[in-house]
């Protein structure tokens, strides 16, 4: 059978078709039904409501929807013993303990098992000591500190503001740093924007409000106690102490009403600048310890938190493929909450609800798609990726072997401004095309396309006329399958105006006021921007399971190749008499780029002349743009870091949200004028060039004619 | 044939300016970034300072921020040092350097020497 025959529509109206069966209304109605109460990942609660999407996506005419459990690494408080922070006077009696739980907003006030604010994984352990303010705790902030300031952390508490990178990273600075607690909290002048009132008035982050995460450094690895293996029946289990990415000093995260308290006391060095200033009114003074009055005061940490082996529930869903149905194309997103959820995940498995629905509709209308496409609802992304990871790390083997590509779908907004995307550079053609076709939300763009308004708002840095596409970091459900499998991956959702705070999230993130009623009050209350992600999410996995010919563009990577050997060059450029010296050479990997172009400018001329109509002939094409993000992976993994395998990107060693890119290279010249052993440092670059160069070259020899 | 040629060394007194110029031939500036990079007598190369894409970014060693500025002319291909309130210890020798757009090897000028003293 022709494609056409065997999906029973014709191409053009089946997009169509899909596109106009998503509603704003049902959007609406999933997330108010997913948000009314917790979904904490390890929970009956989120055990129910995972079997309440299988059977609706069974309804909705999946041809299968299964539940795929583990028994992961969780965290938890302790009940009856909750975490605090206090400051001790000279005779050791608490003069101020931190809250215990955030104030609960209207409506929810008898809802249980809210769980309080927490840091996911912190170990127990009661330090005391003098405080020392850190800024952002970033690798750059405890230079400045250590190596300008000559201020010591070691056997210190650190205060650190939220915001700016991940905050596992902040944890394992600080522990780099020998201090023996972390103090986490959310500063006005990252959490709280000018002119808009806190929540329930306004979407703001009021001073008890808290933002809760996990503080692991997982670097990929799944459950803590199964690196590389499924948490199942079977699975052997490390010992806790040999288990990966734990904390091993007490944090906990608090509100900036009580952050004020600590900080109002604090003397030792002034900042050094204004970039160590927040919004509150204290000095931001870096301490170690209190000023004159209170330098006899000190901060002890209460922590209690426990580890526990407990079962988690993934929901996998199969629309088989017609015509090829051993290719998988995936759109998954998380169901865990830390809460309610309103934001963080729900808004995006609303989204994916209604994608759901949508494909069942045309499939009970005699469509299949061209290729398999599953639907996945993650649990324990809150809890370090795990419900993706451990089910890529089951399948594996049929994963590497047919997975075409995957779309990520957590929160659709994180504001309601503009589009964000961060995707291969495979997908750059796909989502530039797929955006041209869709109509723009934004008010002041009627009648005009979701490319244009993006553009407009969110320019290319590098090419006039078109949008801002990044690079995929971490932190995120697409993780395994990007930066460990190498299958083709993308994002998209609602932003913000705000590029300077990039990676500091909304206001309200991981806080007990991340409800429904935030989402429909003051972020999207007609859901437009909800309905249009649905459009590009879905729109996306359409044409990735149904287009003939895989919509993949090789030569977009060649260019951004190019781009990111420049960009690595240049770093290297500041040393230019020890590339003298050790002989360090950046022509193989301009070679191998350089080769890479003239390949994939020949594969994509060789792609527009062949015969679609030759099954066998068309299947070799698809199956070379398929293994091209394949061909990037390093079965050895970076230095360190054995589950980030992608030679191209890899989440940051500083920031596991941001996308770095040739991350061996990177890594290997970061602060090399400080290592030791000058000649080791340039030997290990030299090898990165090495590692770098061969793998474009033996990438480029992927989309060669085969014979 | 790919080429990069330094212009505007010369003696100058401390505290004065001069300015460097750089014109590449037989290549156009669309790469990533341009370099300035110095040697002095009898040290080794030392980068001075980076010029990215359409010249809206760039960064300089520490000892020279605030005292000079790069820029680029992408119509006229070339690449310009402007370096204000000298000092001795900026007596080098100047070079550029950079890369076509589509070139394996990195282009270095042949440089220019710049003499600070009184």
């Known amino acids: 059978k022709s494609s056409n025959e065997a999906t029973n529509i014709t191409p053009k109206h089946n997009m169509k078709a899909f596109l106009d069966e998503l509603k704003a209304e049902n959007i609406k109605k999933f997330l108010y039904n997913f948000t009314q109460i917790p979904h904490l990942a390890g929970t009956e609660q989120n055990f129910q409501l995972a079997k309440q999407i299988q059977s609706q996506w069974k309804e909705f005419g999946l041809d299968s929807v299964e539940l795929a459990h583990y028994d992961v690494l969780l965290s938890y408080p302790n009940k009856t013993h909750p975490n605090y922070i206090s400051i001790i006077n000279e005779d050791g009696n608490e003069i101020f303990n931190t809250s215990l739980f955030e104030p609960p907003p209207p409506g929810y006030e008898n809802v249980s098992d809210i769980v309080p604010p927490f840091s996911a994984f912190s170990p127990q352990g009661m330090p005391e000591g003098d405080l020392v303010y850190v800024n952002y705790a970033r690798t750059e902030d405890f230079f400045k500190l250590e190596r300008d300031m000559k201020i010591n952390c070691s056997g210190k508490i650190v205060i650190a503001r939220y915001g700016k990178v991940f905050r596992g990273n902040k944890v394992k600075n600080a522990q780099l740093a020998g201090a023996k607690g972390v103090i986490l909290y959310s500063d006005p002048a990252d959490y709280f924007a000018p002119g808009v009132k806190s929540y329930p008035d306004g979407w703001n982050l009021p001073g008890g409000g808290v933002q809760r995460g996990n503080i692991l450094n997982l670097n990929g690895a799944g459950d803590p106690l199964t690196p590389g293996y499924p948490a199942n029946e079977y699975a052997y289990r490390r010992g806790i102490a040999e288990a990966v990415g734990l904390p091993s000093i007490p944090v906990h995260p608090i509100g900036y009403y009580d952050a004020q308290k600590l900080l109002e006391k604090m003397g030792g060095s002034a900042p050094p600048d204004s970039s160590w200033r927040g919004s509150l009114k204290v000095p931001y003074n870096v301490g170690p310890g209190f000023t004159g009055n209170f330098s006899t005061q000190k901060v002890k940490m209460h922590i209690h938190s426990t580890n526990e082996v407990t079962r988690i529930y993934n929901v996998i869903g199969t629309l088989r493929g017609a015509v090829e149905p051993d290719r998988y194309v995936i759109l998954g997103g998380h169901r865990d909450s830390w809460v309610f959820g309103g934001i963080d995940p729900q808004s995006g498995a609303a989204v994916v609800h209604e994608i759901v629905r949508s494909f069942g509709t045309l499939k009970k209308e005699g469509w299949r798609p061209r290729r398999t496409i599953l639907f996945a609802s993650w649990d324990a992304e809150e809890f370090g990726l795990l419900g993706s990871t451990e089910w890529a790390e089951e399948n594996s083997r049929l994963l590497q072997e047919r997975g075409v590509a995957y779309i990520n779908a957590d929160s659709s907004i994180e504001g309601n401004y503009t589009l964000r995307v961060d995707c291969t550079p495979l997908m750059y053609s796909l989502v530039h095309n797929l955006t041209k076709e869709l109509k723009s939300p934004d008010e002041g763009f009627e009648g005009k396309s979701l490319y244009e308004s993006w553009t407009k708002k969110s320019p290319s840095p590098e090419f006039s006329g078109m949008p801002r596409i990044s690079k995929l970091g971490s932190g995120n459900d697409f993780e395994v399958f990007f930066q460990r499998l190498g299958i083709a991956s993308g994002r998209a959702r609602y932003t913000k105006n705000w590029e300077t705070n990039k990676f500091s999230g909304y206001p309200l993130y991981h806080s007990v006021y991340e409800t429904y009623e935030l989402v429909e009050k003051f972020y999207d209350p007609m859901f437009k921007y909800h309905l249009t992600v649905a459009q590009v999410r879905g729109g996306m996995v359409f044409e990735l399971a149904n287009s003939i010919v895989l919509p993949f563009d090789c030569r977009d990577y060649a260019v951004v190749l190019r781009k990111y050997a420049d960009k690595i060059y240049s770093i290297s450029m500041k040393h230019p008499q020890e590339m003298k010296t050790y002989s360090v050479s950046f022509d193989s990997l301009f070679s191998a780029v350089k080769n890479f172009t003239e390949i994939a400018s020949k594969f994509s001329e060789r792609l527009q002349d062949f015969d679609k109509s030759n099954p066998i002939v068309l299947r070799m094409m698809n199956d070379q743009l398929m293994f091209l993000e394949r061909a990037f992976i390093d079965p050895l993994g970076l230095p360190d870091r054995p589950f980030y395998r992608h030679v191209i990107y890899a989440p940051s060693s500083h920031n596991k949200y941001a996308g770095e890119s040739f991350p061996g290279i990177y890594d290997a010249l970061f602060d090399i004028e400080s290592k030791v052993d000058p000649s080791k440092a340039w030997g290990e670059v030299k090898r990165q060039i090495y590692v770098a160069a061969f793998t474009v070259q033996a990438a480029a020899e992927t989309l060669s004619e085969v014979a | 044939e790919v080429q990069m040629v330094e212009s505007g060394g010369g003696v100058v007194q401390p505290g004065r300016s001069l300015r460097l110029s750089c014109a590449a031939s037989?290549?156009?500036?669309?790469?990533?970034?341009m370099h300035w990079v110095r040697q002095a007598p009898g040290k080794g190369l030392e980068w001075v300072a980076t010029?990215?894409?359409?010249?809206?970014?760039?960064e300089y060693v520490d000892s020279v921020k605030g005292r000079f500025t790069v820029s680029i002319d992408n119509a006229k291909n070339t690449l310009y040092l402007q370096m204000d309130s000298l000092r001795a210890e900026d007596t080098a020798t100047y070079y550029c350097?950079?890369?076509?757009?589509?070139?394996?090897?990195?282009?270095w000028g042949l440089g220019t020497l710049v003499t600070v003293s009184s």
């Open positions: 350097v950079g890369r076509d757009s589509t070139s394996i090897t990195p282009v």
């Open positions: 010029i990215y894409q359409d010249g809206s970014e760039s």
């Open positions: 037989g290549f156009t500036f669309s790469s990533y970034a």
